[in-house]
C-alpha cells in the first residue's frame, strides 16, 4: 500500500513538474526589463527563449520570434536544448511510469518488470528535472552577468550631452516556474526510485523442512516472502506544495483602427 502511494505520488509530482517545465519553456517572461533605479518608461520589454515582446503603456503588445538560429547566442541555444531534452525525457518518463503504476493492470506484467519501469521512469524524471534546473540556472547566470555589465555602463554618453539609457533585464517569472518545476520533477523521480525498491520482489528461498510427528506427517514449505519495506509509513503527514505559478501570456495582437469602432 505504501509502495503504491509513493509511486502514485511520485507520478503526480513529476506530472506537475513536467507541466511546469513545458510552461516555463513556452513562457515569454524569462527576462523582464529592470524597473528598479531606471527612468520610468512607457514601454516594458520582456524576453523568452523563442521570442521577445514589448508591451506599451497603451496596452498593445508586440512579440517577435527569433527567426534565426545562427545569430542567437550559444548560451540561449544551450538553454533551449536543455529545456527540450528535459521535456522529452519527462514525457517519455511519464509514458513509461503510466504502465509501471501498481494500480494499473496490463496483462500479466510481472512485478519485476513494473519495478524496472518504475526505476527507468524515476531516473528519467531525475535527469529531466536536472536539465530544467540547469537550463534555468544557465539563463539566470547569463542575466546576472549582463545585468552587471550593463550597470557598469548604464548611461553611455554621446558627446556628453545626450544620454542613451541601456535597458537592463532581470529575472522573469519563467525562471521561478522553471526552478520549482525542475525541483518537483526531481522529487517525483526520487520518489519513483524509492517506490521501485518496494516493488522489486526479493526471492527468499528457505529449504523445505519436514517435521515428523507421531501419527501423521506435515510438511511446511515457507517460500518467497515479499519483503515489506517501511517506506511511506508516514505519508499522511506529508504535504506537497505546488508553487501554483500562473503564466499570463496575454499577447495582444495589434488592433486595427477598426477595433475602436
Amino acid at each position: 500500500m505504501a509502495v503504491t502511494a509513493c509511486q502514485g505520488l511520485g507520478f503526480v509530482v513529476s506530472l506537475i513538474g513536467i507541466a511546469g517545465i513545458i510552461a516555463a519553456t513556452c513562457m515569454d517572461q524569462w527576462s523582464t526589463q529592470d524597473l528598479y533605479n531606471n527612468p520610468v518608461t512607457a514601454v516594458f520589454n520582456y524576453q523568452g527563449l523563442w521570442r521577445s515582446c514589448v508591451r506599451e503603456s497603451s496596452g498593445f503588445t508586440e512579440c517577435r520570434g527569433y527567426f534565426t538560429l545562427l545569430g542567437l547566442p550559444a548560451m540561449l541555444q544551450a538553454v533551449r536544448a536543455l529545456m527540450i531534452v528535459g521535456i522529452v525525457l519527462g514525457a517519455i518518463g511519464l509514458l513509461v511510469s503510466i504502465f509501471a503504476l501498481k494500480c494499473i493492470r496490463i496483462g500479466s506484467m510481472e512485478d519485476s518488470a513494473k519495478a524496472n519501469m518504475t526505476l527507468t521512469s524515476g531516473i528519467m524524471f531525475i535527469v529531466s528535472g536536472l536539465c530544467a534546473i540547469a537550463g534555468v540556472s544557465v539563463f539566470a547566470n547569463m542575466l546576472v552577468t549582463n545585468f552587471w555589465m550593463s550597470t557598469a555602463n548604464m548611461y553611455t554618453g554621446m558627446g556628453g550631452m545626450v544620454q542613451t539609457v541601456q535597458t537592463r533585464y532581470t529575472f522573469g517569472a519563467a525562471l521561478f516556474v522553471g526552478w520549482v518545476a525542475g525541483g518537483l520533477t526531481l522529487i517525483g523521480g526520487v520518489m519513483m526510485c524509492i517506490a521501485c525498491r518496494g516493488l522489486a520482489p526479493e526471492e527468499t528461498n528457505y529449504k523445505a523442512v519436514s517435521y515428523h510427528a507421531s501419527g501423521h506427517s506435515v510438511a511446511y514449505k515457507p517460500g518467497g516472502f515479499k519483503a515489506s519495506t517501511g517506506f511511506g509509513s508516514n505519508t499522511k503527514n506529508k504535504k506537497i506544495y505546488d508553487g501554483g505559478a500562473r503564466t499570463e501570456d496575454e499577447v495582444q495582437s495589434y488592433p486595427s483602427k477598426h477595433d475602436y469602432v
Epitope: 512607457a42 514601454v43 520589454n45 497603451s58 496596452g59 498593445f60
Partner: antibody, heavy 118, light 113 residues
C-alpha cells in the same frame, strides 16, 4: 465612429475645484488608456497623466500630482479629471485623448476651457 | 523630464514648397526591445485638438497624405512635407512617448508667405 465628448467650459474662482468629464463612445472603453493633456493660451501641450479604465491604474506627470485626480466610471464609459486648488495658472484648455500604437494619442476630445478668475 | 526641442519655431513657406522641421530629444527614444523610436508627430489647427500624423517616428497614420514623412532615430527626428498645401498650415508638435512624463516639443508654426 469613435467620439470623445467633453463637458462644457468652466469658470471658477481661485481655490475652487472643478471636475471635467470625457464620455467615450464607438469603441471598448476599458480597452484603451485615457490620457489628459493641457494647453495654455494656444501654446504648447503638457501631458497631465493617464488612466487604465479597466484596472483604474494611473500615471501622473509629477508636475500635476496633487493638482489633478483621474478617475473613470466604467458603467457610463466616462473618464473624469478633477483639478483642485485652482489658480490663474490652471486656466487652459484640457483635452482627453485615447492611446494608440507607440503610446501616441489618436482620438481627442474637443477640449474643455477652464477659466480661473476672481 | 525629457526635453523636446523643436526648430525652427516658425516657418514661412509658399505652396508647393518642400519643408523640413526638426525635433531633438534630451535622451534616446529608441527602444532596444523592438528597435522602434517612440516619437510622435501631431498637427494642430486653430480651435481644434491635435491630429495624429506619425507614430514610431516614421509610421504614417492611416488617412494622412503621403507628402508627410517622418525620419530619424535615437535623439534626432525630422518631419518633412514634400509639397506644402494650404491645408497644411498649422502648428506641428513632436512628442516623447518613451519616458514618463510624456513630453511635447514647443511646436513649429507653419505659415503661408
Amino acid at each position: 465612429e469613435v467620439q470623445l465628448q467633453q463637458s462644457g467650459p468652466e469658470l471658477e474662482k481661485p481655490g475652487a475645484s472643478v471636475k471635467i468629464s470625457c464620455k467615450a463612445s464607438g469603441y471598448s472603453f476599458t480597452a484603451y488608456n485615457m490620457n489628459w493633456v493641457r494647453q495654455r493660451n494656444g501654446k504648447s501641450l503638457e501631458w497631465i497623466g493617464n488612466i487604465d479604465p479597466y484596472y483604474g491604474g494611473t500615471n501622473y506627470n509629477q508636475k500635476f500630482k496633487g493638482k489633478a485626480t483621474l478617475t473613470v466610471d466604467k458603467s457610463s464609459s466616462t473618464a473624469y479629471m478633477q483639478l483642485k486648488s485652482l489658480t490663474s495658472e490652471d486656466s487652459a484648455v484640457y483635452f482627453c485623448a485615447t492611446v494608440y500604437y507607440g503610446n501616441s494619442l489618436i482620438y481627442w476630445g474637443q477640449g474643455t476651457l477652464v477659466t480661473v478668475s476672481a | 523630464d525629457i526635453v523636446m526641442t523643436q526648430s525652427p519655431s516658425s516657418l514661412t513657406v509658399t505652396a508647393g514648397e518642400k519643408v523640413t522641421m526638426s525635433c531633438k530629444s534630451s535622451q534616446s527614444l529608441l527602444n532596444s526591445g523592438n528597435q522602434k523610436n517612440y516619437l510622435t508627430w501631431y498637427q494642430q489647427k486653430p480651435g481644434q485638438p491635435p491630429k495624429l500624423l506619425i507614430y514610431w517616428a516614421s509610421t504614417r497614420e492611416s488617412g494622412v497624405p503621403d507628402r508627410f514623412t517622418g525620419t530619424g532615430s535615437g535623439t534626432d527626428f525630422t518631419l518633412t512635407i514634400s509639397s506644402v498645401q494650404a491645408e497644411d498650415l498649422a502648428v506641428y508638435y513632436c512628442q516623447n512617448n518613451y519616458f514618463y512624463p510624456l513630453t511635447f516639443g514647443a511646436g513649429t508654426q507653419l505659415e503661408l508667405k
